[in-house]
């Protein structure tokens, strides 16, 4: 019976109307000839939010998204016709849905779209400095987008552009069957995962990709892909989905005789996010929806936040699980999954593992191999047939930090902000849902810092109509949250301290790390501020101790609904 299992009522529940009236949301309601505002790129330096949508790319001012520039990038009528001839929907499919939007260098972005089932990429000039105010498409230089953007707008691409090379997890064919992780652009030959081998990838849906250093030597850097895929037969009875983390070495250039132009360091492991059921059978949240990496002081060890939902049609639920990279690395250094025995089931591989261990990056740190092309044949052969790890990655504390079950919505997106409060640092989660609401949740340590309690601070409706939130970015500089959906883009501040009430008690009871009672109002808390009058208690929300100045006259209803 988890504390985080309680469907705790939000301290504040704000409707779209209330959000508008209190100036707590700014919305861009989309253009008549566009939709699908799903692909976000935040540029804090230029103070811009770039958004890829249907036939358009936008550049929004982070201060106020009402101020924006746009690039129109449709497909030619001929491409549109071909797409229509292929039996596709002229409005929902036969357009250029932007799926990749990444910083390419100091002056350009790289963008790819579905191109009406004919993926296409190009460069966008944004200038050297914010004041240049440049935002234009390089229409003289289009590139084939195959292996970069999917053909089908319903599919996602997980991508990462580093050192002029694009890593992307996507579908590389018209039918949406050839899913792969690619590396394209750059000076090297494109590299991909093994084709038509369900042991490597089994109808995956890619979520995100991240570069995480392995050591102080950049040669050891790895790219991690988060995705969900069908469980391989024998791994599970019946059709099931598994959440996955996959790794590849940044300096993987494929094999020499075998796995030529294919990854030689690809490994994947299952991510578990589950709660024990009353009958001893765990309830699994397997449908990975989104991932957020919270950087720590050590760049090698960010905390991974994952949003999951259940696969079941009967039982609808969502969960947030946290993972440590040290646990991930431990699994990748553990036993490989191997099929054996009379029922050909998955078992941990017990035989001799070739040297250097498959999945290790060629570098001075872990062994004497300069390139994956120099790897011995037995390493390549083993890597080809053993892409999966036997052990799964369990979440921190072996359980979700938050679950929601008896509600009519599911989680879709997550961003996390680390906030300095009076009594320490807190991670504040902003969780997007499939009904256009955002939950603001703080993780509060109970007896120990490991045992966390979730406090649901706010539930905000950010779009006029219920719509799935498909993108979220958080600007620490602007202290704003940006949200994308099919309908448009919304912007809201990370905190609304004044809404918590007019008394110290209410401010304290709110337990919002952003807010503190300053003697006369509930306002933004700054740890650097010298004022000793600041009253705040995130850990316990105890106004009696902290509001001894007679400011307890406000209502002390912990579940106060703001209407």
């Amino acid at each position: 019976n988890y504390a985080n299992g309680k469907n705790n009522v939000p301290r504040l529940k704000l409707s779209y109307k209330e959000m508008l009236e209190s100036n707590n949301v700014i919305t861009f309601n989309g253009l008549a000839n566009s939709s699908s505002y799903h692909t976000f790129l935040l540029d804090e330096e230029r103070s811009r939010l770039y958004v890829g949508a249907k036939d358009h790319i936008f550049s929004f001012n982070l201060v106020n998204i009402k101020d924006f520039q746009k690039i129109v990038w449709p497909v030619s009528y001929t491409r549109r016709d071909e797409c229509k001839w292929a039996g596709k929907d002229i409005l929902k499919e036969c357009a250029n849905f932007i799926k990749v939007l990444k910083a390419y260098n100091q002056t350009h972005l790289y963008a790819c779209g579905t191109g009406a089932f004919h993926p296409i990429c190009t460069y966008i000039e944004v200038g050297h400095h914010p004041e240049d105010n440049i935002f234009k498409l390089q229409d003289s230089h289009f590139e084939n987008g195959r292996g970069k953007s999917p053909y089908d707008p319903k599919l996602l691409t997980a991508s990462l552009l580093i050192d002029g090379e694009l890593y992307s997890g996507t579908a590389a064919d018209f039918m949406g069957r050839d899913f792969a992780i690619f590396r394209t652009l750059g000076h090297h030959h494109p590299i991909r995962t093994e084709q038509h081998d369900s042991r490597w990838l089994n109808d995956p849906r890619f979520i995100s990709a991240h570069l995480i250093p392995e050591s102080d030597n950049p040669e050891d850097d790895k790219v991690y892909f988060f995705f969900r895929e069908n469980a391989i037969d024998g791994e599970h009875s019946g059709k099931a989905t598994h959440a996955r983390i996959g790794q590849i070495c940044k300096n993987d250039f494929g094999g020499h005789r075998s796995l030529v132009n294919k990854w030689t360091t690809f490994l994947k492991a299952r991510l578990i996010c589950s709660v024990p059921g009353p009958n001893g059978i765990d309830t699994h949240f397997d449908e990975l929806q989104d991932v957020f990496l919270m950087n720590s002081k050590d760049p090698k060890n960010p905390i991974v936040y994952g949003v999951f939902t259940t696969s079941s049609n009967i039982f609808k639920g969502s969960a947030v699980c946290m993972y440590s990279m040290s646990d991930v690395r431990r699994v990748f250094l553990g036993p490989y999954a191997h099929r054996d025995g009379p029922n050909y089931q998955w078992v941990p591989y017990q035989g001799r593992v070739p040297y250097p261990r498959p999945g290790t990056c060629p570098s001075k740190t872990f062994g004497g191999f300069d390139s994956t092309k120099d790897l011995p044949d037995d390493v390549i052969t083993f890597a080809r047939s053993h892409p999966a790890m036997y052990n799964p990655v369990f979440p921190i504390n072996n359980r979700p930090i938050m679950i929601k079950t008896d509600v009519n919505y599911q989680f879709t997106q997550i961003v996390v902000d680390r906030v300095d409060a009076e009594d320490g640092q807190y991670d504040v989660m902003f969780i997007g849902t499939d009904v256009g609401t955002v939950l603001k949740v703080v993780s509060v340590p109970k007896e120990t810092w490991h045992d966390l309690e979730e406090v649901l601070l706010e539930e905000m409706t950010v779009f006029r109509e219920p719509t799935t939130i498909s993108a979220m970015e958080l600007s620490t500089k602007q202290q704003q949250l940006y949200i994308g959906s099919t309908a448009g883009v919304a912007q809201l501040p990370l905190h609304r301290c004044d809404i918590y009430g007019k008394a110290c008690a209410e401010c304290c009871l709110a337990r919002d790390p952003y807010c503190a009672w300053d003697g006369s109002s509930c306002s933004r808390y700054f740890p650097t501020a010298k004022a000793r009058t600041r009253a705040q208690d995130i850990r316990n929300g105890d106004p009696l101790t902290h509001c001894s100045d007679g400011g307890i006259e406000g209502r002390m209803d912990h579940h106060h609904h703001h209407h």
């Epitope: 009528y77 549109r80 016709d81 001839w85 292929a86 089932f117 084939n144 053909y151 018209f174």
Partner: antibody, heavy 116, light 111 residues
Amino acid sequence: EVQLLESGGGLVQTGGSLRLSCAASGFTFSDYAMSWVRQAPGKGLEWVSWIYYDSGSKYYADSVKGRFTISRDNSKNTLYLQMNSLRAEDTAVYYCAKLNGDFDYWGQGTLVTVSS
Amino acid sequence: QSVLTQPPSASGTPGQRVTISCSGSSSNIGNNDVSWYQQLPGTAPKLLIYADSHRPSGVPDRFSGSKSGTSASLAISGLRSEDEADYYCGAWDSSLSGYVFGGGTKLTVLG
């Protein structure tokens, strides 16, 4: 200059097979869908089949479905039409055409005669 | 029997304006772009008009296309002897999932 050159036509018995080829040049072949259109002697044009630029999708007229197979080799800039179980009514000049929302370039055609 | 209906023949004298009609249905002309093709005797067809009314480069502006509802037409003004050819209309048919042509119109330039 866009050029399409068909080959492989000829005389064939009913029930026989034939493979037509179309060599393309003067444009980025791998970027365009391609099609076959035929014209029976003294008759009008009839669309036969088309193929997506990356072979991802193929479409056929009902009259040839199950007997004809369209394919392409983008590395060789060549389009193919494998014709099996040929009938007398398949006798026609077969044109290879570049698809660009319509048939914007045509080859000179190759004659296929099916005799009974 | 062609899905798109064209008159089998048309004629005119040099300098005259001639119009060729093409009628179809909502599944082809009504909801898809119409193209016109010219086939000179003994040669391959050539694209004359695309997207209802657009001319590819190199096609004289004497040729124009238009569309209304489920019918389209090709107009040739200032008729010349070299315009003597077969003219075909074409469009994608959504219900047949295929491209359809008209039966063709044989244009004769008299005199």
